[in-house]
Every structure is written in structure tokens, then in C-alpha cells.
């Protein structure tokens, strides 16, 4: 009786279980009662990443420099090319099909995590005692100046965007 299901790394065709092609190879001929499945390696610019019965290999992803992309890892016959973004840019999606500039943290916010090729800058509000007066993709919130350590007094209170202003103590 012909099979209705096949083992792992096999597929059913013409009431017969044929071996799948190994990763990195495509199908050129199905098996028959007398012959095994025939496969052929993918060419240099192509890949197949699973045991398969595909008659065509997939093209490697192209990391388009016009979109700010560069190769992070070159593809093989079994793996796709992995793209990342040039310095100062990060991917717009997990599949990294295009890049955008890292965002800057506005005054009052500091950099919690510097951006990478695949993730944007993460900003955080400057807590009490800290400030940021610049728009930056690198600068963290900085602590207010300690007037006391300079034998000075606070003349103007700091905010999340400004440092304190220190001045001399009044002589009485």
C-alpha cells in the first residue's frame, strides 16, 4: 500500500517517499521507484537554508549601500547574507532592509543606550540632580555641579536642561 506520510527529510510524491535535498542544494529530479532524488548545489549568489524540494535556490539578500546597508555576514549556500547599517545609522526593521540615522536625545534627556547598526538610540529623562543641555546621540545626563565642593553656593537652581549656577557666599 502506498505511503500517506513520510519520514523526516523525505517528501511524498507520486505515492512515493523521496529524500529531500540537503541545505545548500536544490532539486533537479524527483526520485522514482528505481532512482534516488537528484540535487544540485546552489550557485555562489544563492542559498537554501533547509532540507527541501525547491527547484530554485533563493538569491542572497543584497546589502544596498545606497540605502546605508553593508554586509555584516556574507551568505553561504545554506545561509542568507546578513546586512547591517553603516556607522550613524540603524535598521528600520528586524529584516534590515533599509537604514535611518540614529535619533538624538533632546535637551532634558540623556542617552541610556547608544545606538548600534540594528537598534536606535534609547533616551531617558534626566532625573533630579542631572541635566542635558544638548541634542546628542552619545551624551548621558550629567550631574549638576556641586557648588559646596568649590566653597560656592547655588545662585540658580538646576533643571533637567541646565546646570546649577554657583556663586560666592555672601560675606556678612
Amino acid at each position: 500500500e502506498p505511503p500517506t506520510a513520510c519520514r523526516e527529510k523525505q517528501y511524498l510524491i507520486n505515492s512515493q517517499c523521496c529524500s529531500l535535498c540537503q541545505p545548500g542544494q536544490k532539486l533537479v529530479s524527483d526520485c522514482t521507484e528505481f532512482t534516488e532524488t537528484e540535487c544540485l548545489p546552489c550557485s555562489e549568489s544563492e542559498f537554501l537554508d533547509t532540507w527541501n524540494r525547491e527547484t530554485r535556490c533563493h538569491q542572497h539578500k543584497y546589502c544596498d549601500p545606497n540605502l546605508g546597508l553593508q554586509v555584516q555576514q556574507k551568505g553561504t549556500s545554506e545561509t542568507d547574507t546578513i546586512c547591517t547599517c553603516e556607522e550613524g545609522l540603524h535598521c528600520t526593521s528586524e529584516s534590515c532592509e533599509s537604514c535611518v540615522p540614529h535619533r538624538s536625545c533632546l535637551p532634558g534627556f540623556g542617552v541610556k543606550q547608544i545606538a548600534t547598526g540594528v537598534s536606535d538610540t534609547i533616551c531617558e529623562p534626566c532625573p533630579v540632580g542631572f541635566f542635558s543641555n544638548v541634542s546628542s546621540a552619545f551624551e548621558k545626563c550629567r550631574p549638576w555641579t556641586s557648588c559646596e565642593t568649590k566653597d560656592l553656593v547655588v545662585q540658580q537652581a538646576g533643571t533637567n536642561k541646565t546646570d546649577v549656577v554657583c556663586g560666592p557666599q555672601d560675606r556678612q
Partner: antibody, heavy 121, light 113 residues
Framework: QVQLQESGPGLVKPSETLSLTCTVS????????LHWIRQPPGKGLEWIGV???????DYNPSLKSRVTISKDTSKNQVSLKLSSVTAADTAVYYC???????????????WGQGTLVTVSS | DIVMTQSPDSLAVSLGERATINCKSS????????????LAWYQQKPGQPPKLLIY???TRESGVPDRFSGSGSGTDFTLTISSLQAEDVAVYYC?????????FGQGTKLEIK
């Protein structure tokens, strides 16, 4: 035993279509693929294309727009057609049996004697 | 396409001596999943069709004398005839069977010195 025999006109005029037939015996075209290869006089080997045992074809991109390979399994024959020929297509044309060694490995294990085709007016 | 380049173009070796033919491919013929190299060698004697000697770089076709051996990996390959016989005079071709279009080297003519 395995045998392959190429046949067809030895002289073809420029711009016409070259037509050759490979007749095989000792194996079935449903079990083995068949390649066409050519060799210009005094030169090296150039792979033209293959018809796999399942019937699908692969061609050399340099000839793809001009070449067609087909088969008639009941007659044990494979045909090669090459259109719009020029003097550069003058060569000995061979057919060869494909052997599959597993793991995606293919080679040409039996060859016909070849037939010389001259393109000239 | 994968370009195959053989060296030397011609070679003269004394009977009983070792003959070595080199073949270089423009890209790797090593399949990373199964670690096999997809290279074949053919012998063509004058007035005859080519004859398959070796496939998968080093596997001799049945009936081929064991004086013929193949080696190499990636892009660099060698055919060695350990002790040249008179009947080995021929042109030798390497061929990549990695993927279509299958391509041949330009051939190396082997003669007796």
C-alpha cells in the same frame, strides 16, 4: 552496454538552425540525464546544457537564447537545436550521459563519439 | 559562471615519472554542508571523446587505474599520475560539477619526454 550516438547534418548555413539527435542504448532517459557539450577544432570543451531525467533543462547562459534541448523517451532520443548559427558554432558536438553520485554530485560518465558540424555558406 | 584555469598548458614527462596538473577555480567548490569538493577530471586522447577519470575531487571512476589520483580543496586542485605510461598521453581537463553552467578548464596537453 551503454552507447550514445550523435547524428545530424555536418554542414549548416549561417543564420540557420543546427539540429542534432543523440540516440542512446543500454540505459533509459527516464533514469539518467543527458548533456550536450561541444569542442571547436583544436580547442577546449564547452558545456551547452543538460536535460535531467525528470525532463527539466539547464542551459549555458552564453547560449540560452539560442538553444533548446528536448527528449523522446520512447525513441531513446535527445535532440539539440541551436538557432542563428555563425562560424563560431563550428565544433564537434558530443552528447554524454549524466551520472549521479549522491550529495548533489553529477558527472558525464559515458560520451558519444561526437559529430563535426561546420557552419559555412 | 565559475572560471576554471589549468596549469601548465602543456607538460612533458618521462615514462615512469610523476606528472602533476593543476586546476584553479574562480570560486570555492567546497560545499560547506557536506564538506565535498565538486571537481572532476577527464582524459581526452586524440580523435576520441573525453573519458571521466575522477569526480568529487578524488573519487576514481570504476576501471580507472590507481596511478591516477586527485587532491585539493576550495579553489586549488591537482591531478597526479604517479608513474606515467605511454597510454596516458592525452589532453586532461578539469571540470567543476558544483553548479550549472558546468565549466571546464582549457586543458593540459601531456606528452612523453
Amino acid at each position: 552496454q551503454v552507447q550514445l550516438q550523435e547524428s545530424g547534418p555536418g554542414l549548416v548555413k549561417p543564420s540557420e538552425t543546427l539540429s542534432l539527435t543523440c540516440t542512446v542504448s543500454g540505459f533509459s532517459l527516464t533514469t539518467y540525464g543527458l548533456h550536450w557539450i561541444r569542442q571547436p577544432p583544436g580547442k577546449g570543451l564547452e558545456w551547452i546544457g543538460v536535460i535531467w531525467r525528470g525532463g527539466n533543462t539547464d542551459y549555458n547562459p552564453s547560449l540560452k537564447s539560442r538553444v533548446t534541448i528536448s527528449k523522446d523517451t520512447s525513441k531513446n532520443q535527445v535532440s539539440l537545436k541551436l538557432s542563428s548559427v555563425t562560424a563560431a558554432d563550428t565544433a564537434v558536438y558530443y552528447c554524454a550521459k549524466n551520472s549521479y553520485y549522491g550529495q548533489g554530485g553529477h558527472a558525464m560518465d559515458y560520451w558519444g563519439q561526437g559529430t563535426l558540424v561546420t557552419v559555412s555558406s | 559562471d565559475i572560471v576554471m584555469t589549468q596549469s601548465p598548458d602543456s607538460l612533458a614527462v618521462s615514462l615512469g615519472e610523476r606528472a602533476t596538473i593543476n586546476c584553479k577555480s574562480s570560486q570555492s567548490l567546497l560545499h560547506s554542508f557536506n564538506q565535498k569538493n565538486y571537481l572532476a577530471w577527464y582524459q581526452q586522447k586524440p580523435g576520441q571523446p573525453p573519458k571521466l577519470l575522477i569526480y568529487f575531487t578524488s573519487t576514481r571512476e570504476s576501471g580507472v587505474p590507481d596511478r591516477f589520483s586527485g587532491s585539493g580543496s576550495g579553489t586549488d586542485f591537482t591531478l597526479t599520475i604517479s608513474s606515467l605510461q605511454a597510454e596516458d598521453v592525452a589532453v586532461y581537463y578539469c571540470q567543476q560539477h558544483y553548479t550549472t553552467p558546468f565549466t571546464f578548464g582549457q586543458g593540459t596537453k601531456l606528452e612523453i619526454k
